[in-house]
Interface confidence: low
């Protein structure tokens, strides 16, 4: 349905508050270095313009596309060239190339200071003084650090952020009320950002077909009672929503997401019995709830898959007539029967099935050729099952911190060229799979673990893409989206790696480590561990454990000393010497 003025249409659909918030997010995700005040000014100008178009859709420039309007506005920033360098060249291009250019310059790891949380009283004062500015600042700071954050979901986070301050700033113990809520929002926010980053990478690097396949599998697990036609419709709509958000079309994305939530709730009888509670909530909560809803129960009387996909004489006919529809149906039927499989495993099975049909349907006796196709699935299913079993046993034995350390060593040996901060961040996140998934019963472990690992390995892939240093990482990241995890799992120690020169400075510590939080202290120690492995890739587990135990004792001792700095200087030298001796450096 064409509208005379797209900007007026979206303003009316979304309302002024959401319109302004989404434009701010869009601008902050594009121009990640611009000061808050500059963005607010641009947003206010766009909003005023939108209002003139609402009043008269035929007014000058109201017929322009949102990309044209927003791009023109971004290109008015005076400091574009000195702040962003070659991104300024985007402004010489015409739409749609200009928007594509802006998208290519989004930075997954922008050089921005870490967000430091002020004292609770300071935050509450700022919140009461100017609530609107306080909340806008939250949107701005998250959006510029997470340029692919799912914009409508960020509105939901902001709503919860506001609710936390509204409640806690009048509580007797403000800190006890507020800090756990902010920690929860921070952790959930990071997880949400990483999940969305994988969706965008899937669309941008592997195309719409890959995303749709993922969506068919996931929605079929979640809504096993829904018919294939219903799942297909939801997949089409969901793909449109995520394509828009990943493409920077945040107003359209938020609008279409609201429409999809409305459709799902109006048709919940033919989708899932689990949606009732979600559908009673207000819009932002409703959309979030639907996205997280538990899997519905599987229909009781599902027939064997073999009848339609192996035994039927029409397999090749059906496949030839509508390949993607037939494969989609296979994926749907397999996924709805297997909520215990990860989505990536289901996609591997579908790929194996497709490859078999491609080969067999051209053979002299197709049925004879594909009759045993389901046997080929067995090793594909067993590989992640065994891996998860082994790693959960290791996690239960070691606990999260030491499990992370085991992964740090494992991954540093696999890809030692990757930067230390990236290895620490990714391995810490990989290690969280233990506490996140190993507590689940067998039937829920694989979807929890392997699909979470896909999200974390995508972080490695996008960070590595910015400054590629390892052919092995590039290969695992680009060859197959669904085989990334098996690809990394299969990597052995990189025998071509030339160990890093020993640098005592890397292992010099100061008294400031004593005032760090437990998490930050862990990161310091894990950074040292990665550096050790880079210096001595052939070091055994026992050698590394001995050095790390000594290091922990050294930190503990010096943090208790009266003259901490002297202790760190003197004991540090001894530790370095002892470590070099222990590792044969």
């Amino acid at each position: 349905d064409a509208h005379k003025s797209e900007v007026a249409h979206r303003f009316k659909d979304l309302g002024e508050e959401n319109f302004k918030a989404l434009v701010l997010i869009a601008f902050a995700q594009y121009l990640q270095q611009c000061p808050f005040e500059d963005h607010v000014k641009l947003v206010n100008e766009v909003t005023e313009f939108a209002k003139t178009c609402v009043a008269d859709e035929s007014a000058e420039n109201c017929d322009k596309s949102l990309h044209t309007l927003f791009g023109d506005k971004l290109c008015t920033v005076a400091t574009l060239r000195e702040t962003y360098g070659e991104m300024a060249d985007c402004c010489a291009k015409q739409e749609p190339e200009r928007n594509e250019c802006f998208l290519q310059h989004k930075d997954d790891n922008p050089n921005l200071p870490r967000l430091v949380r002020p004292e609770v009283d300071v935050m509450c004062t700022a919140f009461h003084d100017n609530e609107e500015t306080f909340l806008k600042k939250y949107l701005y700071e998250i959006a510029r650090r997470h340029p692919y954050f799912y914009a409508p979901e960020l509105l939901f986070f902001a709503k919860r952020y506001k609710a936390a301050f509204t409640e806690c700033c009048q509580a007797a113990d403000k800190a006890a009320c507020l800090l756990p809520k902010l920690d929860e929002l921070r952790d959930e926010g990071k997880a949400s950002s990483a999940k969305q980053r994988l969706k965008c990478a899937s669309l941008q690097k592997f195309g719409e077909r890959a995303f749709k396949a993922w969506a068919v599998a996931r929605l079929s697990q979640r809504f096993p009672k829904a018919e294939f036609a219903e799942v297909s419709k939801l997949v089409t709509d969901l793909t449109k929503v995520h394509t828009e958000c990943c493409h920077g079309d945040l107003l359209e994305c938020a609008d279409d997401r609201a429409d999809l939530a409305k459709y799902i709730c109006e048709n919940q009888d033919s989708i899932s019995s689990k949606l009732k509670e979600c559908c009673e909530k207000p819009l932002l909560e409703k959309s979030h709830c639907i996205a997280e809803v538990e899997n519905d129960e599987m229909p009781a009387d599902l027939p064997s898959l073999a009848a339609d996909f192996v035994e039927s004489k029409d397999v090749c006919k059906n496949y030839a007539e509508a390949k993607d529809v037939f494969l989609g149906m296979f994926l749907y039927e397999y996924a709805r029967r297997h909520p215990d499989y990860s989505v990536v495993l289901l996609l591997r099975l579908a790929k194996t099935y497709e490859t078999t049909l491609e080969k067999c349907c051209a053979a002299a006796d197709p049925h004879e050729c594909y009759a045993k196709v389901f046997d080929e699935f067995k090793p594909l299913v067993e590989e992640p099952q065994n891996l998860i079993k082994q790693n959960c046993e290791l996690f239960e034995q070691l606990g999260e911190y030491k499990f992370q350390n085991a992964l740090l060593v494992r991954y540093t040996k696999k890809v030692p060229q990757v930067s230390t901060p990236t290895l620490v961040e990714v391995s810490r996140n990989l290690g969280k799979v233990g506490s996140k998934c190993c507590k689940h019963p067998e039937a829920k472990r694989m979807p929890c673990a392997e699909d979470y690992l896909s999200v974390v390995l995508n972080q490695l892939c996008v960070l590595h893409e910015k400054t590629p240093v390892s052919d092995r990482v590039t290969k695992c990241c680009t060859e197959s989206l669904v085989n990334r995890r098996p690809c990394f799992s299969a990597l052995e120690v990189d025998e071509t790696y030339v160990p890093k020169e020993f640098n005592a400075e890397t292992f010099t510590f100061h008294a400031d480590i004593c005032t760090l939080s437990e998490k930050e202290r862990q990161i310091k120690k894990q950074t040292a561990l990665v550096e050790l492995v880079k210096h001595k890739p052939k070091a055994t587990k026992e050698q590394l454990k001995a050095v790390m135990d000594d290091f922990a004792a050294f930190v503990e001792k010096c943090c208790k000393a009266d003259d901490k700095e002297t202790c760190f200087a003197e004991e540090g030298k001894k530790l370095v010497a002892a470590s070099q001796a222990a590792l044969g450096l």
Epitope: A226, F228, S232, K233, A322, V325, M329
Partner: nanobody, 123 residues
Framework: DVQLVESGGGVVQAGGSLRLSCAAS????????MGWFRQAPGKERERVVS????????YYADSVKGRFTISRDNAENTVYLQMNSLKPEDTATYYC????????????????WGQGTLVTVSS
């Protein structure tokens, strides 16, 4: 052998109504999506409306939205097409079709076809 038998066609005045039926045999009816297509003389066959296996999802061509309604009775192995506010341009042979793997409702997804029933709308 699979059979789809259409009935209910005929001549009707513009603005009038007709109800077409399609009785299916030889297939597990509830496992198939059903559709109605039509072909006017000298024109290509076009999709009119389709309904998914359980009846929870339907597709209507823009030209018939609000006027035609598809429904199915899985117990009776029958699909119905209620046509109201008929127009002369609705004149065509109407075909019933069954699809095992139906996603978008395009013609190539349908496995079995009926012989057709003629609908003539006079002005």
């Amino acid at each position: 052998d699979v059979q789809l038998v259409e009935s209910g066609g005929g001549v009707v005045q513009a603005g009038g109504s007709l109800r077409l039926s399609c009785a299916a045999s030889g297939l597990t009816f509830s496992s198939y999506a059903m559709g109605w297509f039509r072909q006017a003389p000298g024109k290509e066959r076009e999709r009119v409306v389709s309904i998914s296996r359980g009846g929870g999802y339907t597709y209507y061509a823009d030209s018939v939205k609000g006027r035609f309604t598809i429904s199915r009775d899985n117990a009776e192995n029958t699909v119905y097409l209620q046509m109201n506010s008929l127009k002369p341009e609705d004149t065509a042979t109407y075909y019933c079709a069954a699809a095992r793997y139906w996603a978008t409702g395009s013609e190539y997804e349908f496995d079995y076809w009926g012989q057709g029933t003629l609908v003539t709308v006079s002005s």
